[in-house]
Structures are given as structure tokens and as C-alpha cells.
């Protein structure tokens, strides 16, 4: 025998109290698949969470984070604070990058400036807490006997830190 509940579509539940009639999900609840015996309570986006998508009878609400925070976890289960450029998030909040390190994003960690001398280059632009150094031509390229000056290397595009 076929289960009568299997005929209940998404957005309804199979109401055992009413001879297994398909009843609409009550307000603030949803069922995303057919044949459900209960509807799930809609997620509420409160506090630092804000509503990205309203709950409907067939799908849960989706949250994101208010400005100054970013999502972490499956389905934005957590909101982690942003820091300013030139800072990193520590266990005790946002802290300025130490001298010799930088962070050009609102999240991630402070990373060491590029060591231009490892590539035989000179520092063209000093680094800051927010920006990496820019390496210029090697000292040999700048010597009077050099036939031509190589153009400065473009600033290294740092990869994103793992979050």
C-alpha cells in the first residue's frame, strides 16, 4: 500500500491528527521536500545576523552578517568580525600588524614583507602595515656600465591567507 503522506508536496506536512491530510506549513515554518510529517521551524536572523533570503513555506531563511562581520561555517552559522587593513584578527580581537608584516585585506593574517634581496633586487617602495614592499631593479642593473635599466617589477600580488 502506498503511504498517503507521500502525496504531500513541499510546503505542506502530513497531518496525523486530520486523517493524514496534507496541511500547509504553519507560519514561520517550512518543508523543503514532499512527504514530510512535520514542518521545520524557520531560521531567524537576529543580532549580528541579517536576513539574506526570507523563509517561505518550501525553503528556510538564509542569513548573512551585518557590516563589520563576515560569515563562517556552513550556511553562515557564525559571524566573525572584520578587521581593518593593517590588522589581523587575534583571539583577543583586532591587532595591528607587527613591523615587517602587512595585511591588505579585512580578514586573514599579517604576512611578512617580500625580501627583495632574495631575488637580488632593491626596495623601490617601502612596505607598510597595509602594503607589501615594492621591489625594484637589482643594484647591478643600476650600475653606470649597465646597458639598460630593467623596469621595476610589479608589486607582488599576495595570495589570500587561509581562513
Amino acid at each position: 500500500l502506498q503511504d498517503p503522506c507521500s502525496n504531500c508536496p513541499a510546503g505542506t506536512f502530513c497531518d496525523n491528527n486530520r486523517n493524514q491530510i496534507c496541511s500547509p506549513c504553519p507560519p514561520n515554518s517550512f518543508s523543503s521536500a514532499g512527504g514530510q510529517r512535520t514542518c521545520d521551524i524557520c531560521r531567524q536572523c537576529k543580532g549580528v545576523f541579517r536576513t539574506r533570503k526570507e523563509c517561505s513555506s518550501t525553503s528556510n531563511a538564509e542569513c548573512d552578517c551585518t557590516p563589520g562581520f563576515h560569515c563562517l561555517g556552513a550556511g553562515c552559522s557564525m559571524c566573525e568580525q572584520d578587521c581593518k587593513q593593517g590588522q589581523e584578527l587575534t583571539k583577543k580581537g583586532c591587532k595591528d600588524c607587527c613591523f615587517g608584516t602587512f595585511n591588505d585585506q579585512k580578514r586573514g593574517i599579517c604576512r611578512p614583507w617580500t625580501n627583495c634581496s632574495l631575488d637580488g633586487k632593491s626596495v623601490l617602495v617601502n612596505g607598510t602595515k597595509e602594503r607589501d614592499v615594492v621591489c625594484g631593479p637589482s643594484p647591478a642593473d643600476l650600475s653606470p656600465g649597465a646597458s639598460s635599466v630593467t623596469p621595476p617589477a610589479p608589486a607582488r600580488e599576495p595570495g589570500h591567507s587561509p581562513q
Epitope: 584578527l89 587575534t90 583571539k91 583577543k92 591587532k95 587561509p162
Partner: nanobody
Framework: EVQLLESGGGLVQPGGSLRLSCEAS????????MSWVRQAPEKGLEWVSS????????FYADSVKGRFTISRDNSKNTLYLQMNSLRAEDTAVYYC?????????????????WGQGTTVTVSS
Amino acid sequence: EVQLLESGGGLVQPGGSLRLSCEASGFTFSSYAMSWVRQAPEKGLEWVSSISGSGGSTFYADSVKGRFTISRDNSKNTLYLQMNSLRAEDTAVYYCAKEGTTETDDYHYNMDVWGQGTTVTVSS
């Protein structure tokens, strides 16, 4: 697959106690430091406590120092948080998190796997 599953949350009166557990699977538990982090309804994530892979080093946020105790049982792949003298401001969803290194401290924020959380409500 790396998984963390918290339990032990609930409703407790101010001044009461709770013990949270976090069961880990999918990685060599003793090789990694672990942390507890919480999110209160109106706030972002707040670090609570961390413990090294061996359990020999522990660190606490000032807000919980002297009231909360972090511990681990590497033979059971389980992390614990004993919470005493609970206050209304401790109300939050508590997450356990795996860190990316064996050692830990109270500065570097390098959690890379999170549990789904357990809710602690402190209210009379």
C-alpha cells in the same frame, strides 16, 4: 571527513554549572590544539579558551578566567569545557574548533574546523 560534535548545552540558572563536550573524528586528535569559541545573540564570535594537543598548556579569555576549565581526553578524542559560576552574559552558542597546530597560545587565531554548536542559556 573531519567532524566536531558538541553536546551538553542547556538552560541553567545564574551561578550554576554546565559541562560541554566535543567529540572529534576524522583526524589525529592529539596532534592538534583545540579551542572553545562562543557567539552571543548580539555579538560576533568571542574566543573562550584553548588547549594544546597534549593538554599541557591552557589559555583563557579574561571574561571566563577562574570560572571555566578546558580539558581533553585524547584516548576518547573528546574536548571538554567545565563552566562554573555562570552569568547571564555567558549566554551564547558555544562552538568547539580545531586549530591548525599542536601548540597554542592566547593570541594566534588559527581555527580551521568548527562544530555545529551547542546553546547555553543562563537565566533565572
